[in-house]
Amino acid sequence: DLKVEMMAGGTQITPLNDNVTIFCNIFYSQPLNITSMGITWFWKSLTFDKEVKVFEFFGDHQEAFRPGAIVSPWRLKSGDASLRLPGIQLEEAGEYRCEVVVTPLKAQGTVQLEVVASPASRLLLDQVGMKENEDKYMCESSGFYPEAINITWEKQTQKFPHPIEISEDVITGPTIKNMDGTFNVTSCLKLNSSQEDPGTVYQCVVRHASLHTPLRSNFTLTAARHSLSETEKTDNFS
């Protein structure tokens, strides 16, 4: 009996430019003899419904149809037919199929590969054209993929125990596609500093599929109006 097992859940998520290993494990009732077996990896793009051969291994012959693609012969001996792809790109997302032949048996498994890019975030203060005591804070998120992103603004006063989401005077612009396929977006918060308590902490909070925890950039309203802080980076997808 020959069986192939892929990533549980049927989906693997990997960061852009990562050296990704797409998992494929072989289960066979007898010890594997790699000289009399074959492994072929196929890829089907998200945009075209056509399958392309990525890598093949037959006995003493192996060929990478995608530069750098490799299946380790040493690991194959113990049933690990995982495919390693260095420097994964956004356009390489899609369905990957691992086909194993141990004559006369054949088994296969598929997995969806999602390639994500984490946003970088920065806060800017724009006072051009603003009235006295009025400030416009811009939160720029750049270089993210996929396009879906959630940017919110929160404030935390000194006295109250938890933050509150700000919904008024917030404008989030359209996402803009970059040449490399990633996206940028800017969200703006308009503040009347004379109406706000000194010591209030404001945060731009970015939530994206590539982030385990939100990316936060904050500033504190001081008596001297404002002090921008560096982006507080939390751990990106790894």
């Epitope: 006295k159 125990p161 938890h162 509150i164 945060q203």
Partner: antibody, heavy 117, light 107 residues
Framework: QVQLVQSGAEVKKPGASVKVSCKAS????????MNWMKQAPGQGLEWIGG????????DYNEKFKGKVTMTVDTSTSTVYMELSSLRSEDTAVYYC??????????WGQGTLVTVSS | DIQMTQSPSSLSASVGDRVTITCKAS??????VAWYQQKPGKAPKSLIY???NRYDAVPSRFSGSGSGTDFTLTISSLQPEDFATYFC?????????FGAGTKLEIK
């Protein structure tokens, strides 16, 4: 990191007073507001009051006015809550709490005050 | 003072179950509602703020919803460590007030 360390458990007789302390570390002490909460055995939570750590102002729940006094010693970054004229219904765990960050607000470990004759 | 009425007061469920706890405010509190989890002998731990935002270390199985007067905490798939007491809290104004709590027990 932020830590709020409270004084140990107390056993008091009815009519006595008790002073519970909460020592803060890991942040700029005076720029925060500290709240105190009460949790009677098997009960929910009640807000007792709060104090600006610069010592500027206090705000007490009407229910606890005359019962509680909050003070600050900025030199030791410690907040105190004194409960007077203790009765059996004052038996509870008392918590000091501070506004949080993006992992939530900060709480002391709690101080059990038992009022028993 | 704003009253926070929480229901049910206790609830028995099994690992893997979906559980919903509700909280009703006596007046409009906007989205100024937080949810806490408390285990015996421990201080409460914040889960949700601003009605629906999860604090960063909180697992995604916890979610909050609602605004105005009606609020809900949902645990999508109960884990063994989720058996505890849950409280809602309004923080739109002082005095801060809490719900009476919902004790979540293993069925």
């Amino acid at each position: 990191q932020v830590q709020l360390v409270q004084s140990g458990a107390e056993v008091k007789k009815p009519g006595a007073s008790v002073k519970v302390s909460c020592k803060a570390s890991g942040y700029t002490f005076t720029s925060y507001w500290m709240n105190w909460m009460k949790q009677a055995p098997g009960q929910g939570l009640e807000w007792i009051g709060g104090i600006y750590l610069s010592g500027e102002s206090t705000d007490y729940n009407e229910k606890f006015k005359g019962k509680v006094t909050m003070t600050v010693d900025t030199s030791t970054s410690t907040v105190y809550m004194e409960l007077s004229s203790l009765r059996s219904e004052d038996t509870a765990v008392y918590y000091c709490t501070r506004r949080g960050d993006y992992f939530g607000d900060f709480w002391g470990q709690g101080t059990l005050v038992t009022v028993s004759s | 003072d704003i009253q926070m009425t929480q229901s049910p007061s206790s609830l028995s469920a099994s690992v893997g179950d979906r559980v919903t706890i509700t909280c009703k405010a006596s007046q409009n509190v906007g989205k100024y509602v937080a949810w806490y989890q408390q285990k015996p002998g421990k201080a409460p731990k914040s889960l949700i703020y601003s009605a629906s935002n999860r604090y960063d270390a909180v697992p995604s199985r916890f979610s909050g919803s609602g605004s105005g007067t009606d609020f809900t905490l949902t645990i999508s798939s109960l884990q063994p460590e989720d058996f505890a007491t849950y409280f809602c809290q309004q923080y739109i104004s002082y005095p801060l007030t809490f719900g009476a709590g919902t004790k979540l027990e293993i069925k």
